[in-house]
Amino acid sequence: QNLFTKDVTVIEGEVATISCQVNKSDDSVIQLLNPNRQTIYFRDFRPLKDSRFQLLNFSSSELKVSLTNVSISDEGRYFCQLYTDPPQESYTTITVLVPPRNLMIDIQKDTAVEGEEIEVNCTAMASKPATTIRWFKGNTELKGKSEVEEWSDMYTVTSQLMLKVHKEDDGVPVICQVEHPAVTGNLQTQRYLEVQYKPQVHIQMTYPLQGLTREGDALELTCEAIGKPQPVMVTWVRVDDEMPQHAVLSGPNLFINNLNKTDNGTYRCEASNIVGKAHSDYMLYVYDPPTTIPPPTTTTTTTTTTTTTILTIITDSRAGEEGSIRAVDH
């Protein structure tokens, strides 16, 4: 055998080159046939009416032909025939790769609630061979479940991802990424998750700055509530007691002027949205006013007083509510 060919892999729409190579040629007739065994080239002449075939080289040692705008119907065995004695035949297989025509991502719900499991589907249509689909949530790879549907030598792959969403997932992209031999670089599509979650409540003492509350001083607490959708109701209540008469409520702020021991107790900020409600508690303890020491007449003494503020976080395990923060000043 002194007739040689090489298999060709080509992307749909691109150019395939078919080469029939002859070692030790005696100038015998050489021809190239298509998978239907129709003659494409007889020597340097193309009897076939398909003008996508063009002669690149014809000599006693080679018949080289290009096929432009390759389609999937061009796939198959192409035969080189050399009419020596005995005649020789060799075939080259053209494999046509078809990149996915379309990449579609579909999320079951536009908006999900934290803790909910949602279904995300990604479909890569009409590729050859079948596409591999990979899933990412942000930079984290996730595992999906793929189904392949074959139709007329083409493959449509649908990958299903079941995703339990958390509040941290809000605004994070879910990425469907395709791996296919006809695709160079990244072919991907993404959708951003929209996750609704109940408020997170945090109490901040904005006055006094040093954190020690004494009789006669003022107290200002600010309630920060973050949720999705943003909480519309932020309310202050005093646990197990009435709110002091001299307390002033202004939106998320609670002001108590001229603190006295009767103000001691737990102050709760409550916030809610359509997902649920949560609260945070602040435990107020009013200290005695500082005692005044008269200055000495002969010697000067510097006294340094160190005040320690302890913030204790207590988790409230009541069902359906966020763990509350109880800030206790000693």
Partner: antibody, heavy 115, light 108 residues
């Protein structure tokens, strides 16, 4: 000059064997197919068959049972034998070079079959 | 019966354009070749492939193809173009040669 020269008996009796030879003068005998074509008087062209230098043949299915085409590469010659001739085989017989199309023809030999 | 079909006779006025056609299933895949034959002479190739003329053939001869029909067009026919014209191709397998029945062209 590239040419085809043909010769053979011009008068045959029915049931005899027609025998014609064609010689190619030029380069690349091995690079082509070599055909025989005939034309009955006042009628159209009819392809008989073809051969290449290695002896591979293709024949007209309607004549295949009676036809033999052979080749002698040492002389750049090919020959036609047609058995059991009848008056219907009376025709001008042409040899031709084939590159799929027939780009070179012999001058033709009139073969008459008559008792 | 031929696998390629031609009109038996066509006439054209001197200097006018004439088209000779050839029909057959194999022409869906393959180009036809065209031959001119004058009385007492061997055929001469005038057109082959998509529209190729051998050297020495005037450029008034041209070929075209559509579907299962091949055409030979003579633009500005001359008196010396009066002859029989044969189309030829191979069958779909490529193994057997077929000729049309021939068209007699008369130049008036």
């Amino acid at each position: 000059q590239v040419q085809l020269q043909q010769w053979g008996a011009g008068l045959l009796k029915p049931s005899e064997t027609l025998s014609l030879t064609c010689a190619f003068y030029g380069e690349s005998f091995s690079g082509y197919y070599w055909s025989w074509i005939r034309q009955p008087p006042g009628k159209g062209l009819e392809w008989i068959g073809e051969i290449n230098h290695s002896g591979s043949t293709n024949y007209n299915p309607s004549l295949k049972s009676r036809v033999t085409i052979s080749v002698d590469t040492s002389k750049n010659q090919f020959s036609l034998k047609l058995n059991s001739v009848t008056a219907a085989d009376t025709a001008v017989y042409y040899c031709a070079r084939s590159s799929w199309y027939f780009d070179l023809w012999g001058r033709g030999t009139l073969v008459t079959v008559s008792s | 019966s031929s696998e390629l079909t031609q009109d038996p006779a066509v006439s054209v006025a001197l200097g006018q354009t004439v088209r000779i056609t050839c029909q057959g299933d194999s022409l869906r895949s393959y180009y036809a070749s065209w031959y001119q034959q004058k009385p007492g002479q061997a055929p001469v190739l005038v057109i082959y492939g998509k529209n190729n003329r051998p050297s020495g053939i005037p450029d008034r001869f041209s070929g075209s193809s559509s579907g299962n029909t091949a055409s030979l067009t003579i633009t500005g026919a001359q008196a010396e173009d009066e002859a029989d014209y044969y189309c030829n191709s191979r069958d779909s397998s490529g193994n057997h040669v077929v000729f049309g029945g021939g068209t007699m062209l008369t130049v008036l």
